[in-house]
């Protein structure tokens, strides 16, 4: 059923809820629909590489994933690590480099599977301020070629939450990341389970705001595990 996977991030389940937290450790998160894919929010070269502390894969670059630097190391100390190339061992999709995904513990090409596929991106020029309708002409482009919004405002393309104005976080929106509002009291959230396949969500939500935590809604305690609603509540 639709509700049976509200609190799961596993790709095999569907449809999961729309939207997870964007790089905020210990905060509310929920899976989003459809394809999970390796990605991130910054590009680095080996030459200037410096360990970047992280809590989630979303905080790392396109060619990185978030993990403890040493095998069996302290789970509390995680940094962005270089992605694994084809035929290398993996535990989740985000560990594999772009164009690959984790299958049976090995990074394999996503070209061999419908799992990701090439995604066609069409950017449409709109001759006015209203971008709600996609009129005009289309052209193929890269994801970063045009930003429609002032940096930091809601809807701005961003790399990480520090790029966004106060009250906003940087969260996935299809194959980009945009500034979205931090969740307020009473808004629905889902506890982030670190087990299973946690990839990057297509529709991602922010975390609960300051002074709030994601907890089971009181009147839903009697409901079955699968349909329990979590909301942002005062500590």
């Amino acid at each position: 059923t639709l509700n049976s996977v509200l609190n799961s991030n596993a790709i095999k389940n569907l449809p999961p809820p729309l939207g997870g937290a964007a790089g905020h450790p210990g905060s509310a998160v929920s899976a989003a629909p459809g394809i999970l894919y390796p990605g991130g929010n910054k590009y680095q070269t080996i030459d200037n590489y410096q360990p970047y502390p992280c809590a989630e894969d979303e905080e790392c670059g396109t060619d990185e994933y978030c993990a403890s630097p040493t095998r069996g190391g302290d789970a509390g100390v995680q940094i962005c690590l270089a992605c694994r190339k084809r035929r290398k061992r993996c535990m989740r999709h985000a560990m594999c480099c772009p164009g690959n995904y984790c299958k049976n513990g090995i990074c394999v090409s996503s070209d061999q599977n419908h799992f990701r596929g090439e995604i066609e991106e069409t950017i449409t020029e709109s001759f006015g301020n209203d971008h709600s309708t996609l009129d005009g002409y289309s052209r193929r482009t890269t994801l970063s070629s045009k930003m429609y919004h002032t940096k930091g405002q809601e809807g701005s393309v961003c790399l990480r939450s520090s790029d966004c104005a106060s009250g906003l976080c940087c969260a996935r929106h299809f194959w980009s990341k945009i500034c979205k509002p931090v969740l307020k009291e009473g808004q629905v959230c889902t506890k982030h389970r670190r087990k299973g396949s946690h990839g990057l969500e297509i529709f991602q939500r922010c975390y609960c705001g300051e002074g709030l935590s994601c907890r089971i809604q009181k009147d839903h305690h009697q409901a079955s595990n699968s349909s329990r609603l979590h909301t942002c509540q005062r500590h």
Epitope: L6, P15, P17, L18, G19, S30, P33, E120, E121, T122, I123, T124, E125, S126, H131, S132, L134, S138, K146, Y148, H149, E154, G155, V157, H173, F174, S176, I178, K180, P181, Q187, V188, C189, T190, I202, F203, R205
Partner: nanobody
Framework: EVQLVESGGGLVQAGGSLRLSCAAS????????MGWFRQAPGKEHEFVAG????????YYADSVKGRFTISGDNAKNTVYLQMNSLKPEDTAVYYC??????????WGQGTQVTVSS
């Protein structure tokens, strides 16, 4: 609370066409975009196509590129999926989903598309 209602599914022969619609009601916040997803029997949930009002982009999975077209109007809270040259492997329940600025779990109930060979 936002309600998403899909329509337009049905039984069609291979090579035929269908047009799915998804109407959103109860929206009090802005939507960043909407998408279509599908699940075939025994298969994983699959992204089909998406439209971003915020970025002015459309997105397609490889398997439907050139055959399916997503369109819509954010002001009218509606998104469409024009499906041409349908194949038996397109048989699935098609779901509409919305990326809202206020909450996280807006899905329609789905509409069945069956393509016979």
């Amino acid at each position: 609370e936002v309600q998403l209602v899909e329509s337009g599914g049905g039984l069609v022969q291979a090579g035929g066409s269908l047009r799915l619609s998804c109407a959103a009601s109860g929206r009090t916040f802005s939507s960043y975009g909407m998408g279509w997803f599908r699940q075939a029997p025994g298969k994983e949930h699959e992204f089909v196509a998406g439209i971003s009002w915020t970025l002015g982009r459309t997105y397609y999975a490889d398997s439907v590129k050139g055959r399916f077209t997503i369109s819509g109007d954010n002001a009218k809270n509606t998104v469409y999926l024009q499906m041409n040259s349908l194949k038996p492997e397109d048989t699935a329940v098609y779901y509409c989903a919305s990326d809202e600025s206020d909450a996280y779990n807006y899905w329609g109930q789905g509409t069945q598309v069956t393509v016979s060979s």
